[in-house]
Interface confidence: medium
């Protein structure tokens, strides 16, 4: 029951945590299960124990085997087992199943791939990421802390993702790689969160008194048929139709445009002959659908003629 599988590649660092947990103050002793020989704690050894952690720096195929850890407290002892397998590095690109960590699934709205076991290591950014052995390039991929974020996930993004990082131990660097599969699931064809593309939250829009001004409220709602999706403008919390200012009107822009498969809506607010009092109003762009509502607020400011000239 208190046994844990751990694996790694030869010549890489491998750190294993004792499957039995205890307070940091408790001592943990590590042994080779077959020989009952104690594992040293001195860091000059290639394999050494450091509290709850057993460190292979670097690992060798011959290190494979079962290791016993005993968590000792004043009142009890707890025993755990770490089943460690070290594999030879593959010459080809394929990552065999036995080296794979748990599969994660993502969607258009949630595409984080966490680097497995990284929290055991003393590493510094950046993390390197590979898909099917190819280094990931392009603005859609963002290595963020201990995970990879993929923007606008598509079904083609499914595959095996490998993270590579450097573990530092007393000034010496060791390489670590870990691979897991990523699958893409369709979130039932719609998004729960309207995303307002424009305007930005609390945007200040510069306008010229006496001229016409247009404000566009643009939001996307997900893929496929959208229930109750709408975008609209409010002035000081009141719908345009109820506000009673004929100079200010809204009209639908593109209806349900499917760029990138996303269902989006636009609503343009047209202000004719901008007046001083228009600068005092609060303009709210609202995006709502079946599941909720998001609001972005815009205010108008007078365009400085000097700025205009420059």
């Amino acid at each position: 029951k208190f046994s844990k599988q751990s694996w790694g590649l030869e010549n890489e660092a491998l750190i294993v945590r004792c499957p039995r947990q205890g307070k940091p103050s408790y001592t943990v002793d590590w042994y080779y299960s077959q020989t009952n020989k104690s594992i040293p704690t001195q860091e000059r050894n290639r394999v050494f124990a450091s509290g709850q952690l057993l460190k292979f720096l670097p690992a060798a195929v011959a290190d494979s085997g079962i290791y016993t850890c005993i968590v000792r407290s004043p009142t009890f002892n707890r025993t755990g087992y770490a089943n460690v397998t070290i594999y030879k590095k593959q010459s080809d690109c394929n990552v065999p199943d036995y080296l794979m960590y748990s599969t994660v699934s993502g969607s258009e709205k949630n595409s984080k791939i966490y680097c497995p076991t990284i929290d055991l290591y003393n590493w510094t950014a950046p993390l390197e990421w590979f898909k099917n052995c190819q280094a990931l390039q392009g603005s859609r991929y963002r290595a963020h802390k201990s995970f990879l974020v993929i923007d606008n996930v598509m079904t083609e993004d499914a595959g095996d993702y490998t993270c590579k990082f450097i573990h530092n131990e007393n000034g010496a660097n060791y390489s670590v790689t870990a691979t897991r599969s990523f699958t893409v699931k369709d979130e039932q064809g719609f998004s729960l969160f309207p995303v307002i593309g424009a305007p930005a939250q609390n945007e200040i829009k510069e306008v010229e008194i006496g001229k016409n001004a247009n404000l566009t409220c643009s939001a996307c709602f997900g893929k496929g048929t959208q229930f109750l999706a709408a975008v609209l403008w409010q002035l000081n919390g009141t719908k345009i139709t109820d506000f009673g200012e004929p100079r200010i009107q809204q009209e639908e822009g593109q209806n349900q445009s499917f760029s990138n498969g996303l269902a989006c809506l636009d609503m343009v607010l047209r202000i004719a002959d901008v007046k001083e009092e228009d600068l005092l109003l609060q303009y709210d762009c609202l995006a709502l659908n079946l599941h909720g509502l998001r609001r972005h607020t815009v205010r108008l400011s007078r365009k400085n003629p000097i700025d205009h000239h420059s």
Epitope: S107, F190, F193, F227, L228, L232, K239, L286
Partner: antibody
């Protein structure tokens, strides 16, 4: 306080239409969804449709598609549900119910959830 | 459509005892992006409209006594009345609002033994 007051009971002939009203008070009408749910005698609850008064958009259960129209009059904070081509199996109590709203500061988003305020119900009897 | 199935159809419990109602959805109503279960529970007493008790599967609506609690995730949910009171005699419905159409369970009638 927040309340929904529905129009009185109706007796209708098969093939005719009925329009039930639901007057909201005590909250900003356009900020909340309004659902319509019906309950046949001795039966469970059946969702009819919903309107977002703020955007005016509606969606209906497939069962009622083409026969039901939900509208909202913001000036009077009243929602309406009109059901046409009535048949005897439409005999039921019709409820309007406000969709609950919960603000999430982390998402800067207003979630709609469940139905937190209900009207008293309007009995519609369809009989020849 | 997501089908909601409640069990049992009726339940007789002694005053002060625990009452448990189960609700199963034909597909998950957990939206992983916000980790919320789009499930609500309602109480309906004879001649009255339903009353919202629980939303997001486990959040008690304000004013609802704390003897009512909701639990579960994904497809399996439970409404528990920890100590049944006389005023709790009613029909209880679960409802998903994850997708259109919104659907209800068939109801569970709770009576006093």
């Amino acid at each position: 306080q927040v309340q929904l007051v529905q129009s009185g009971a109706e007796v209708k002939k098969p093939g005719s239409s009925v329009k039930v009203s639901c007057k909201a008070s005590g909250y900003t009408f356009t900020d909340y969804q309004m659902h319509w749910v019906r309950q046949a005698p001795g039966q469970g609850l059946e969702w009819v449709g919903v309107i977002n008064p703020g955007g005016g958009s509606t969606t209906y259960a497939q069962t009622f598609q083409g026969r039901v129209t939900i509208t909202a009059d913001e000036s009077t904070s009243t929602a309406y549900m009109e059901l046409s081509s009535l048949r005897s199996e439409d005999t039921a109590v019709y409820y309007c119910a406000r969709g609950g709203v919960e603000y999430s500061s982390s998402w800067d988003y207003y979630y709609y959830y469940g139905m937190d305020v209900w009207g008293q119900g309007t009995t519609v009897t369809v009989s020849s | 459509d997501i089908v909601m199935t409640q069990s049992p159809d009726s339940l007789a419990v002694s005053l002060g005892e625990r009452a448990t109602i189960n609700c199963k959805s034909s597909q998950s109503v957990l939206y992983r992006s916000n980790n919320k279960n789009y499930l609500a529970w309602y109480q309906q007493k004879p001649g009255q409209p339903p009353k919202l008790l629980i939303y997001w599967a486990s959040t008690r609506e304000s004013g609802v006594p704390d003897r009512f609690s909701g639990s579960g995730s994904g497809t399996d949910f439970t409404l528990t009345i920890s100590s049944l009171q006389a005023e709790d005699v009613a029909v209880y419905y679960c409802q998903q609002y994850y997708s259109i159409p919104v659907t209800f369970g068939q109801g569970t009638k709770v009576e006093i033994k």
